[in-house]
Amino acid sequence: GCLSQLYANTFFRGGDLAAIYTPDAQHCQKMCTFHPRCLLFSFLAVSPTKETDKRFGCFMKESITGTLPRIHRTGAISGHSLKQCGHQLSACHQDIYEGLDMRGSNFNISKTDSIEECQKLCTNNIHCQFFTYATKAFHRPEYRKSCLLKRSSSGTPTSIKPVDNLVSGFSLKSCALSEIGCPMDIFQHFAFADLNVSHVVTPDAFVCRTVCTFHPNCLFFTFYTNEWETESQRNVCFLKTSKSGRPSPPIIQENAVSGYSLFTCRKARPEPCHFKIYSGVAFEGEELNATFVQGADACQETCTKTIRCQFFTYSLLPQDCKAEGCKCSLRLSTDGSPTRITYEAQGSSGYSLRLCKVVESSDCTTKINAR
Amino acid sequence: IVGGTNSSLGEWPWQVSLQVKLVSQNHMCGGSIIGRQWILTAAHCFDGIPYPDVWRIYGGILNLSEITNKTPFSSIKELIIHQKYKMSEGSYDIALIKLQTPLNYTEFQKPICLPSKADTNTIYTNCWVTGWGYTKERGETQNILQKATIPLVPNEECQKKYRDYVITKQMICAGYKEGGIDACKGDSGGPLVCKHSGRWQLVGITSWGEGCARKEQPGVYTKVAEYIDWILEKIQSSKERALETSPA
């Protein structure tokens, strides 16, 4: 179930997955929630003696049991991911942090009259992930009222330092407040030749687009279908970027599908989850558990309720079926995507719905028997 | 469906085949189950054949070639074509069929949710069109139900592609810039469904297109969210009439 409480002066021991810098525990919790494997986190609000670089450290953790031993640590805040917290799920982070310099790669500097204006500049710049604003009281006159637009490979600051009269914050693209626009075009039989930031295995271009949307540096993508000539690239989703923020002209390529991230969309932002169940498909990955259930929908439900499950395969092979149902294999991987996709007539596969805002319901909202 | 793939049994349990039985029996259009006694389809399916008794409706079917004279079908009790539908125009291409007897819901035959009126501005990103129609412009009806995923196209953009037509707010367009995937002849009246917030919704009714799967020529669908009041009103008034005529 949903565990949203925070534990003060507590640090979880072990289970380390990744460490990043975040300005507060709430932001750390958000980062953990949207990380494919993170279930628990510990945040250091106060720097430990002699380890000043650990202040603002956000330590993302996992555990097979869903819990880790707690140790007392002054100034540490720990908690759980909100992966199963339905209505609390949001990547949007609107808080402003006074007296903090969130460092990263400064790619643009301009004069603005307010923090709000600076945040808007960041929200409306395709590359900007976070910003720092120097107020009119900043000690260096030449930087006063300057807005620094920043980015990093992780989408989070490379370090955070307390500095008087600096104010920092994040882009509000994830709050659906960007005015950049929303290019929803899908280009069939076209590939973008731009810089790859990452690649994942996906069953179709729509999942690829959603993965791109929630990747910090993906601006557009190219997906190679199951018919693609190079076997190792079949069902591979290449997440891409470019200096200009726009793709270079696409190349005609049979069995390739390309499109854009929807992270700048206002209305069409997808949820960070994939509802569709793919029949005739098997998702490979690290086996978490196997149960016997009746139908692929029930298998998806089981995966959704199993917090570590990222995706599943439901098998209808005679040897995989018993009186109580057929085999539902719950799986996971390092990046949340299958390690490989194969095509098997007797299989159905899909993803956990743990990051979906609204819980699945078979009830229709418009009732035709009501007036 | 052009550029689609075979569906599996029960994948689209709301899809029905509307067939006409004259000398021979032929699949004419698709339709969607929206209630135990109600099918939603396109008005143009009945142009020239507005006679309820020649139509047969098959639900829970994947392969049309498996239909025999023993296959159960539903008959039309009442055919309600939108009062503003005109054969000379493309607007108001929507019709309701009231069945003689209510359907039994099964894994393979159950209703699709209707959107709410508030969904007129919802942007859907996971949409599918299904049908037994042609797989190319000069093709033939398919035996196995076909499916294809298709992105929605904003109305303003769609209007630019169809300068000789009026794309009204009661229409919704879907297709790929490069073409290649689309509904086609025989898919009319069938569903354009989108999964939104974990729920499949009937977003469009296959209506028309310039050819099939042509470059820069999206498919045009009747936008169901714009007709919710009409659908509810017709179903309700049909119920009220039934009450008036039933024995005391």
């Epitope: - | 493309g90 000789d164 037509y165 025989g186 898919d187 009319s188 028309w208 310039e210 050819g211």
Partner: antibody, heavy 125, light 108 residues
């Protein structure tokens, strides 16, 4: 009741100009594509031009391209044909017609369902 | 352009007889875009058949249309006195839209 009424025809010298009008009533004019068709004395029907419902798209027969301009005023429910550089071979009865565009088998249909009574244009010196 | 060739040029028949008019197109025409019109002297043309086979409103059922691709036919099952006129086929599948040269149905 749908009605189309042409006017503006008459005798004009070669090289001259004429503007035909077609007043429409009984239907939502702005929803329909409109067309002009002509018929030379004792000859068959010849399509001249059409205009999209909004007026933003026009197409012409090669024989009139560059000389004739089709336009419409949806607020006045009126279709126009501006004819310049007229030639003797443009002598004909000019009909305006409504283009019906229904739907059949998931495609559109196209046909001229209502015609005006025609207006005669004579080009002669 | 798509050329429509109608045959015969003239058809001489008596009332009560069956008339079969042919329209051949130089290229494939989607039957949805093939129409037939009737024209009597001094009158505007009148729509008879659209979509190759659908009768227009108010047209008697003795008129029927058939055909697809490049061969289309208009049939008048039993000629009535008012049916003697010129008949045109027309395509709007591709621009320029074109008419056939017409078939005159006259009283024998």
């Amino acid at each position: 009741e749908v009605q189309l009424l042409e006017s503006g025809g008459g005798l004009v010298q070669p090289g001259g100009s004429l503007r035909l009008s077609c007043a429409a009533s009984g239907f939502t004019f702005s929803h329909y594509l409109m067309t002009w068709v002509r018929q030379a004395p004792g000859k068959g029907l010849e399509w001249v031009s059409y205009i999209s419902p909004s007026g933003g798209h026009t197409i012409y027969a090669d024989s009139v391209k560059g000389r004739f301009t089709i336009s419409r005023d949806n607020s006045k429910n009126t279709l126009y044909l501006q004819m310049n550089s007229l030639r003797a071979e443009d002598t004909a009865v000019y009909y305006c017609a409504r283009v019906a565009r229904g739907i059949a088998a998931r495609s559109r249909t196209s046909y001229f369902d209502y015609w005006g009574q025609g207006t005669l244009v004579t080009v002669s010196s | 352009e798509i050329v429509l060739t109608q045959s015969p040029g003239t058809l001489s028949l008596s009332p009560g007889e069956r008339a079969t008019l042919s329209c051949r197109t130089s290229q494939f025409v989607n039957s949805n875009y093939l129409a037939w019109y009737q024209q009597k002297p001094g009158q505007a043309p009148r729509l008879l058949i659209y979509g190759a086979s659908s009768r227009a409103t108010g047209i008697p059922d003795r008129f029927s249309g058939s055909g697809s691709g490049t061969d289309f036919t208009l049939t008048i099952s039993r000629l009535e006195p008012e049916d003697f006129a010129v008949y045109y086929c027309q395509q709007s599948s591709r621009t320029p839209w074109t008419f056939g040269q017409g078939t005159k149905v006259e009283i024998k």
